[in-house]
C-alpha cells in the first residue's frame, strides 16, 4: 500500500514570498507523484512547480494559489493511488488602490456645506488600519469636522468647506506590510475668493527659431493676479523681461508667446495664479526644443527568393517622437500588400528578384528629417557559364580546372579534390573567377575534381577527371657517382616512366661496347666480376615513341672497400698518463682516418696540446683526465666507402700502494703505462 | 481473485450510443485508477480516457464530448458511455487497472 | 495533441539477434520518465514488459530492457527468442492525467 510519510498541511504564507507543501510517500514500488488544485492537475510553472514530491512556490499569489491543495500517488503498474490531506494557503497580502469619491455621485455635485465621503481602495488580508492624509498631512480621528470609517475605509467629510480643499490621499497598514493610494483625489471645495485653474498650460515642443505658446488663466472673486516665472524664478513681464526671454509676450488673457525659440528658451515655465484669499496656484509647463539624431547604417542585406523577410529600421532619438516610413524607388510603402511597411518594419513576402534595390527608411519631427538606405539583393542560385571538363595536364606544369557560374550576389566556389576540401596552398589557387590552378602537376594529382558554387539561395556543382600526362623521366635519377668494388659482382640500376613504358640501355660514354663479362638487363647494368677496367662514364638511356629520349650519365669508380689493419682496443689509463688508441685502416681510394670522441668530432686543427693524431691514423692524448673517458671512434673513408670501429677509454685514479703489497705487484686491470 | 471483465460491447447503428461496463472483483474501486483503451482490427492501441481513485475523469482529445467514463462503487463496476458512433470507432475496448492488469476486452461494431 | 512516433513500423529479424526500437514523444512525459512498454500477440491483450523507462515488469525476462529520458526511449531485446516475434507499443503519461500510445513496431521473422 502506499503510505504518505509526509503530508501537505495548511499555511500562512505571504503574497509574493517562497512556500513550499511537502509530501513524502512510502511505497513497494516506484510511484508517480503529481498535485491537484481544487481537484485539477496542477502543471508546472517557473512560479509554481514540483520539487521531488513536494509542491515549491517561487512566490505565492492570492489569486492563483487559493482553493485546495492535494498529494495524489499513483503506482501506475498496479494502478493504486492515494491522496494525501487538504492543504491550503492564509495569503497574507496588501494591494495598493485609488483614493475616489463616494458621496456626492460626482465632483460636479460637490458644494460648500454637502457632506462628502471619500473611500480608501486599499485592500488586504488580514484587513488593514487606515490612515488620512491632505496634502500630506495626517488627519487625526475625531477631529470635529470630519470622521474615519476604518471598516469602510471612508473619510466623511460634514459639512465640507473651502479650508476641506486639498489633495487626499490614504495609506493602509497590516501583519503583511504598508501601501498607499496609487492614486490621489484634488477635492476642490469653490470660495469665490480662492484663484481656481481655467485653463493650464501644456507642454509643448517646437522647432529652433519657431513661435511656442503657453495658455493659462485662473478665475475668482475679484480677479486673480497672474504671474509667469521661468526656470530661474525670473518673472516675465511685458515691463521687465530677462536678458534671454527679450522676444517673450504676456497677453492680457495670461497667454506667453515665444518667438524666435532658441535653446535656451528651453526649460520649465510656471503660471501662478493668486486669489484675494488661499494658496497660490502654480502650474508648470515645459518648453522642448525639437531634436533628431542621426540614423544608424544599414548592413547590406542579402535574401533568398521565395522567402520572407524583414528589415528593423530604429527610429532616431529625438523628439517629438519621429515618424517613420520606408520608400522604395522614391514611393512610400503601403501598409498591407506583398511589400509592406509594419510598425517600423519593411516586410517583404514571397521575395522576388524584382525586389532586389534600395529602400530608404525616413525619419521625421518638427527638428527635420533623416534617412538611411538599404541595399536589398535578392540572392539566385547560380547558372553554369562554363563547367569544368575532363583534362588531361602535363606533369610539372601549370593545369587549369573551369568553374565559371554567375549568380547574385557573386558565388562562392570552393573545389574538392577526392571528396576533400582543396584549401589554397603553395600548389592550389583558386582565382575570383572560380578557376582552379594547380601550379606543377604530380602523376598523384590525376583524379576527380569537384567544384561548388553557391549563394545564400542554393548551389550547383560538377565534376571532371583530370588525367596526367607524365614526363619522360628517370625514377629515380641515377646518382652521378658510384663506386664498385674490385674482384666482387656489381649491378647498376636505372629505370624510367613516361606516357608510354621507355626502353633502358646503357652505354659507355666513348661509344665502346660493354665487355661480355658486363649485361644490360632491363635497364640494370650487371657486371659479374669488377675490374679495374671497368670504371670510367656510362650513360644510360630512357627512350619512347612520342617522348623521345633522355639520358643520365653514371661515373663507375672500381675501389677496394676500406678494412681496419688494426683497431682500437678497450683502454684504461692512469689518470695524468698518456693514452694511445691505434687505428690503421686500408683500401683503394687510401682512406683517409677520422676519429669521433664522446659524440663529437676531433678537428685535427682544433685539438690542443694534449691531443694528438699520427699519420698513421692514431690518437694519443697526453696528461689525461677523468673527464677524457668515454667512448672513442675511429672512422675510415673514402669516396666509395666509410666504416668505423670503437672502444672505450677509462680514466682512473692511481692507487696508493698498500703496506702488505710490494712496489712491484702488479695493478688489478690491464694499464698501458708509460 | 483480481480480475476484470468487460461487457456491453455488440453491433451498433452509426449516431447510436453504447454503454460498456468492466466489472471489478478482487479489490475497490476507491483506491484504484481505472483506464479504457481501444484497439481498432487490425490497428494500434488508442487511449481513451481514466478515471481516478476520486472519480474525477480525463480524456484524449478526440474523446471528449462523445464519451463519458462513470463508476458505480457499491457495484464496484466502471462504465464507458459512448454517444454519436461512427464507424471509425468499431474495436475491441479494454478496460485496464493501471498498466499491469487488463481485461479480456469487448467488440464494438458501428454499422448499418 | 501528443503524438507518439515509434520506428521502425515493421522490423524483421532472426532468432539471437539485437533488436533496437525507438519511441519519441511529441513532448516530455511525466517526471521525464513515465514511459511504457508493452507486448501484443493477436487476439491478446497486452502484456507489460517495461515500467517507468527501465523497470522490468515481473516475470518479464532479462533481454528485454528500456532507457531513455524526456521524450526520446529505446526497448532493447538483447537476443532475441522465438516467443518474441510480436507486436510492440510504447505508452507515455503526461502532465494533467494524459496518456498516449505509439502506433507500435510489428516484429517478425526475417
Known amino acids: 500500500a502506499i503510505v504518505f510519510i509526509k503530508q501537505p498541511s495548511s499555511q500562512d504564507a505571504l503574497q509574493g514570498r517562497r512556500a513550499l507543501l511537502r509530501c513524502e510517500v512510502e511505497a513497494p514500488g516506484p510511484v508517480h507523484v503529481y498535485w491537484l488544485l481544487d481537484g485539477a492537475p496542477v502543471q508546472d510553472t517557473e512560479r509554481r512547480f514540483a520539487q521531488g514530491s513536494s509542491l515549491s512556490f517561487a512566490a505565492v499569489d492570492r489569486l492563483q494559489d487559493s482553493g485546495t491543495f492535494q498529494c495524489v500517488a499513483r503506482d501506475d503498474v498496479t494502478g493504486e493511488e492515494a491522496r494525501s490531506a487538504n492543504a491550503s494557503f492564509n495569503i497574507k497580502w496588501i494591494e495598493a488602490g485609488p483614493v475616489v469619491l463616494k458621496h456626492p455621485a460626482s465632483e460636479a455635485e460637490i458644494q460648500p456645506q454637502t457632506q462628502v465621503t471619500l473611500r480608501c481602495h486599499i485592500d488586504g488580508h488580514p484587513r488593514p488600519t487606515y490612515q488620512w492624509f491632505r496634502d500630506g498631512t495626517p488627519l487625526s480621528d475625531g477631529q470635529s469636522n470630519h470622521t474615519v470609517s476604518s471598516k469602510e475605509r471612508n473619510l466623511t467629510l460634514r459639512p465640507a468647506g473651502p479650508e476641506h480643499s486639498g489633495l487626499y490621499s490614504c495609506c493602509a497598514h497590516s501583519a503583511f506590510g504598508q501601501a498607499c493610494s496609487s492614486q490621489n483625489f484634488t477635492l476642490s471645495i469653490a470660495d469665490e475668493s480662492f484663484a481656481r485653474v481655467v485653463l493650464a498650460p501644456q507642454d509643448v515642443v517646437v522647432a529652433r527659431y519657431e513661435e511656442a505658446m503657453f495658455h493659462c488663466q485662473f478665475s475668482a472673486q475679484p480677479p486673480p493676479s497672474l504671474q509667469w516665472l521661468f526656470e530661474d524664478e525670473t518673472p516675465i513681464t511685458n515691463r521687465s523681461r530677462p536678458p534671454h526671454l527679450r522676444r517673450a509676450t504676456v497677453f492680457a488673457n495670461g497667454s506667453l508667446l515665444l518667438t524666435q525659440v532658441r535653446p535656451r528658451n528651453a526649460g520649465i515655465y510656471r503660471c501662478i495664479g493668486q486669489g484675494q484669499r488661499g494658496p497660490p496656484i502654480i502650474l508648470e509647463a515645459t518648453l522642448h526644443l525639437a531634436e533628431i539624431e542621426d540614423m544608424p547604417l544599414f548592413e547590406p542585406r542579402v535574401f533568398t527568393a521565395g522567402s520572407e523577410e524583414r528589415v528593423t529600421c530604429l527610429p532616431p532619438k529625438g523628439l517629438p517622437e519621429p515618424s517613420v516610413w520606408w520608400e522604395h524607388a522614391g514611393v512610400r510603402l503601403p501598409t498591407h500588400g506583398r511589400v509592406y511597411q509594419k510598425g517600423h518594419e519593411l516586410v517583404l513576402a514571397n521575395i522576388a528578384e524584382s525586389d532586389a534595390g534600395v529602400y530608404t527608411c525616413h525619419a521625421a519631427n518638427l527638428a527635420g528629417q533623416r534617412r538611411q538606405d538599404v541595399n536589398i539583393t535578392v540572392a539566385t542560385v547560380p547558372s553554369w557559364l562554363k563547367k569544368p571538363q575532363d583534362s588531361q595536364l602535363e606533369e610539372g606544369k601549370p593545369g587549369y580546372l573551369d568553374c565559371l557560374t554567375q549568380a547574385t550576389p557573386k558565388p562562392t566556389v570552393v573545389w574538392y579534390r577526392n571528396q576533400m576540401l582543396i584549401s589554397e596552398d603553395s600548389r592550389f589557387e583558386v582565382f575570383k573567377n572560380g578557376t582552379l590552378r594547380i601550379n606543377s602537376v604530380e602523376v598523384y594529382d590525376g583524379t576527380w575534381y569537384r567544384c561548388m558554387s553557391s549563394t545564400p539561395a542554393g548551389s550547383i556543382e560538377a565534376q571532371a577527371r583530370v588525367q596526367v600526362l607524365e614526363k619522360l623521366k628517370f625514377t629515380p635519377p641515377p646518382q652521378p657517382q658510384q663506386c664498385m668494388e674490385f674482384d666482387k659482382e656489381a649491378t647498376v640500376p636505372c629505370s624510367a616512366t613516361g606516357r608510354e613504358k621507355p626502353t633502358i640501355k646503357w652505354e659507355r660514354a666513348d661509344g665502346s661496347s660493354l665487355p661480355e663479362w658486363v649485361t644490360d638487363n632491363a635497364g640494370t647494368l650487371h657486371f659479374a666480376r669488377v675490374t679495374r677496367d671497368d670504371a670510367g662514364n656510362y650513360t644510360c638511356i630512357a627512350s619512347n615513341g612520342p617522348q623521345g629520349q633522355i639520358r643520365a650519365h653514371v661515373q663507375l669508380t672500381v675501389a677496394v672497400f676500406i678494412t681496419f689493419k688494426v683497431e682500437p682496443e678497450r683502454t684504461t689509463v692512469y689518470q695524468g698518463h698518456t693514452a694511445l688508441l691505434q687505428c690503421e685502416a686500408q683500401g683503394d681510394p687510401k682512406p683517409l682516418i677520422q676519429w669521433k670522441g664522446k659524440d663529437r668530432i676531433l678537428d685535427p686543427t682544433k685539438l690542443g696540446p694534449r691531443m694528438h693524431i699520427f699519420q698513421n691514423g692514431s690518437l694519443v692524448i697526453h696528461d689525461v683526465a677523468p673527464e677524457d673517458s668515454g667512448r672513442y671512434t675511429c672512422i675510415a673513408g673514402n669516396s666509395c666507402n666509410i666504416k668505423h670501429t670503437e672502444a672505450p677509454l677509462y680514466v682512473v685514479d692511481k692507487p696508493v700502494p698498500e703496506e702488505s703489497e710490494g712496489p712491484g705487484s702488479p695493478p688489478p686491470y690491464k694499464m698501458i703505462q708509460t | 481473485e483480481v480480475q476484470l471483465v468487460e461487457s456491453g460491447g455488440g453491433l451498433v447503428q452509426p449516431g447510436g450510443s453504447l454503454r460498456l461496463s468492466c466489472t471489478a472483483s478482487?479489490?475497490?474501486?476507491?483506491?484504484?485508477?481505472m483506464n479504457w483503451v481501444r484497439q481498432a482490427p487490425g490497428k494500434g492501441l488508442e487511449w481513451v480516457g481514466i478515471i481516478d481513485s476520486s472519480g474525477s475523469t480525463y480524456y484524449a482529445s478526440w474523446a471528449k464530448g462523445r464519451f463519458t467514463i462513470s463508476r458505480d462503487t457499491s457495484k464496484n463496476t466502471v462504465y464507458l458511455q459512448m454517444n454519436s458512433l461512427r464507424a471509425e470507432d468499431t474495436a475491441v475496448y479494454f478496460c485496464?487497472?493501471?498498466?499491469?492488469?487488463w481485461g479480456q476486452g469487448t467488440l464494438v461494431t458501428v454499422s448499418s | 495533441e501528443i503524438v507518439m512516433t515509434q520506428s521502425p513500423s515493421t522490423l524483421s529479424a532472426s532468432v539471437g539477434d539485437r533488436v533496437i526500437i525507438t519511441c519519441q514523444s511529441s513532448q516530455s512525459v511525466y517526471n521525464n520518465n513515465l514511459l511504457a512498454w508493452y507486448q501484443q500477440k493477436p487476439g491478446k491483450a497486452p502484456k507489460l514488459l517495461i515500467y517507468?523507462?527501465?523497470n522490468l515488469a515481473s516475470g518479464v525476462p532479462s533481454r528485454f530492457s528500456g532507457s531513455g529520458s524526456g521524450a526520446e526511449f529505446t526497448l532493447t531485446i538483447s537476443s532475441l527468442q522465438p516467443d518474441d516475434f510480436a507486436t510492440y507499443y510504447c505508452?507515455?503519461?503526461?502532465?494533467?492525467?494524459?496518456?498516449?500510445f505509439g502506433q507500435g513496431t510489428k516484429l517478425t521473422v526475417l
Open positions: 485496464a487497472r493501471g498498466l499491469y492488469l
Open positions: 517507468y523507462t527501465s
Open positions: 478482487g479489490f475497490s474501486l476507491h483506491n484504484y485508477v
Open positions: 505508452q507515455g503519461g503526461y502532465n494533467g492525467n494524459i496518456y498516449a
